[in-house]
Amino acid sequence: HTAAQDNCTCPTNKMTVCSPDGPGGRCQCRALGSGVAVDCSTLTSECLLLKARMSAPKNARTLVRPNEHALVDNDGLYDPDCDPEGRFKARQCNQTSVCWCVNSVGVRRTDKGDLSLRCDELVRTHHILIDLRHRPTAGAFNHSDLDAELRRLFRERYRLHPKFVAAVHYEQPTIQIELRQNTSQKAAGDVDIGDAAYYFERDVKGESLFQGRGGLDLRVRGEPLQVERTLIYYLDEIPPKFSMKRLT
C-alpha cells in the first residue's frame, strides 16, 4: 500500500509508526516499543504486540488451566524480548534477573529461575483451544451456521488458512474453536495460530488491533454473537517442565 492511498498507516496494526520511506514512496512501518519493521499485509506477531502494549497503559489478562499439559497466561502482561523476526525469545527475564522459558505464544512453560536458566529452543504451541461463552439469545445458534461464520472470520479477518481451524464445537452457551498448526504444516507466509488467537482475543474484548476498522461485529444469520467471556488454552509440541511443587 502507498502513502497516498492510506496516509501511511498499517492496516493490520495500529500500534505502529509509519513513514513513506519504501520504494516509490511506499509506506513502511515499525512496531511501537521494539522498533521492529513489520509487514502490514499480515498480522503482527504477538511478541511485538505485547512489547508495544507495554509502552501503553496496561490491562493484565488472566486465564485458567484445563489439564496438566495445557498452559494459560497466568502471569499477566510482561515486557517480552523478541527476535528481529518478532518471535518470542525462548528465555525471558525481568528487570530483577528472574528468568523463565516460554513457548511460541510467550506463555511461561517452566518454573522461574535465575540468569543461569537455559532455554534451548523455542517450543512451538501447536494446539490452541479458544473457549467462549456467548450472551443469552432467543435460541441456540445453528451449529453449522456458527461453524461457517467463525471459519470465515478466521480466514478473512485474520488471514488464517482454513486448514488450521481444526474444529468448532458448540453446546449453548459454550463455543470452542480449535486451532492446530504443527511446525511441519506452517509454510512461509502462513499466519501463526498464536497470532490469530491473540488478535481474536483482543477483538472480542473490544480492543481491536486493526487500524481504523470497526470493532468485531459477529453475526450468525443476522443474529449478533456477543461474547461474555474468553478462555484460551495452549498445548505445546513438547510438554511443559514445571516442578511437582507447582502442581500440588
Epitope: A3, S19, P20, P23, R30, S34, G35, A37, P84
Partner: antibody, heavy 119, light 107 residues
C-alpha cells in the same frame, strides 16, 4: 529540497551537557510522515545512531540503549527544529554529530558538528 | 543489536574498474538495508535503500543486491568522484546500526 542546518558548541566540558540543534527547511518537524534522527561518528565507534523523534498524532521518541539514560531529543514546532541533549558527557562522547531525516532511509543530513569533550 | 560486517575494509581500484563491496548482517534483515557514500569532512549521502532501490539523483552505475544476511554494493565502472568510504546500514530494527565502512582508494 529538504535542508538541515546544525548549530551548537564545539567544545563541552566533562560532566556537562552537550546541546545541539537541527533547523529544518523544506519540511516540518511535525510532519506526520517524517522521522528526525541524531547520529554521531567517531574513529572508535564508527557511525552510531543515537535516537529519533517523530509526530504521529502525538510525539514518539526512541533512543539507543547505549545512551538511553543520558539522551533527550526534543522537537520545537515554533522554530521548526529539533534538538539533542546528552548529559552528562565524557571524553568518549567526542565525535562528529549529525542530524538526519528518515526512518528506513536517511535521505537528508545536516552538515555535521564536531563536538570535543575536554576540560 | 544487529552487527554489520563490511568487507573489504580497504579497496584499491582504478578508474573504470568494477567494484563490489559486501555487507553481512549478524541476523536476517530481509531487504531492510541502505548504502551510503561519505567523503572526508562531509555527511554521508544515501545511494541505495531497500537493498536494491537507487536513490533519486544517484548515478545508475551504483547498484545493490541481496536479502537476508548477505548484501552487495556494486559500482559498475568506477569514476574519479567515487573514491570515498561506503557504509551499509540495517533499518530492520532499532537501534539502527551501520557497518564499519569500506574505503575505496585510487590504485
Amino acid at each position: 529540497q529538504v535542508q538541515l542546518q546544525q548549530s551548537g558548541p564545539g567544545l563541552v566540558k566533562p560532566s556537562q551537557t552537550l546541546s545541539l540543534t537541527c533547523a529544518i527547511s523544506g519540511d516540518s518537524v511535525s510532519s506526520t510522515s517524517a522521522v528526525w534522527n541524531w547520529i554521531r561518528q567517531s574513529p572508535s565507534r564508527g557511525l552510531e545512531w543515537l535516537g529519533r523523534t517523530c509526530y504521529r498524532s502525538k510525539w514518539y521518541n526512541d533512543y539507543a540503549v547505549s545512551v538511553k539514560s543520558r539522551i533527550t531529543i526534543t522537537p520545537d514546532t515554533s522554530k521548526n527544529q529539533f534538538s539533542l541533549r546528552l548529559n552528562p558527557v565524557t571524553p568518549e562522547d567526542t565525535a562528529v554529530y549529525y542530524c538526519a531525516r528518515g526512518d528506513f532511509r536517511f535521505d537528508s543530513w545536516g552538515q555535521g558538528t564536531l563536538v570535543t569533550v575536554s576540560s | 543489536d544487529i552487527q554489520l560486517t563490511q568487507s573489504p575494509s580497504f579497496l584499491s581500484a582504478s578508474v573504470g574498474d568494477r567494484v563490489t563491496i559486501t555487507c553481512r548482517a549478524s541476523q536476517g534483515i530481509s531487504s531492510y538495508l541502505a548504502w551510503y557514500q561519505q567523503k572526508p569532512g562531509k555527511a554521508p549521502k544515501l545511494l541505495i535503500y531497500a537493498a536494491s532501490t537507487l536513490q533519486s539523483g544517484v548515478p545508475s552505475r551504483f547498484s545493490g543486491s541481496g536479502s537476508g544476511t548477505e548484501f552487495t554494493l556494486t559500482i559498475s565502472s568506477l569514476q574519479p568522484e567515487d573514491f570515498a568510504t561506503y557504509y551499509c546500514q540495517q533499518v530492520k530494527i532499532y537501534p539502527l546500526t551501520f557497518g564499519g565502512g569500506t574505503k575505496v582508494e585510487i590504485k
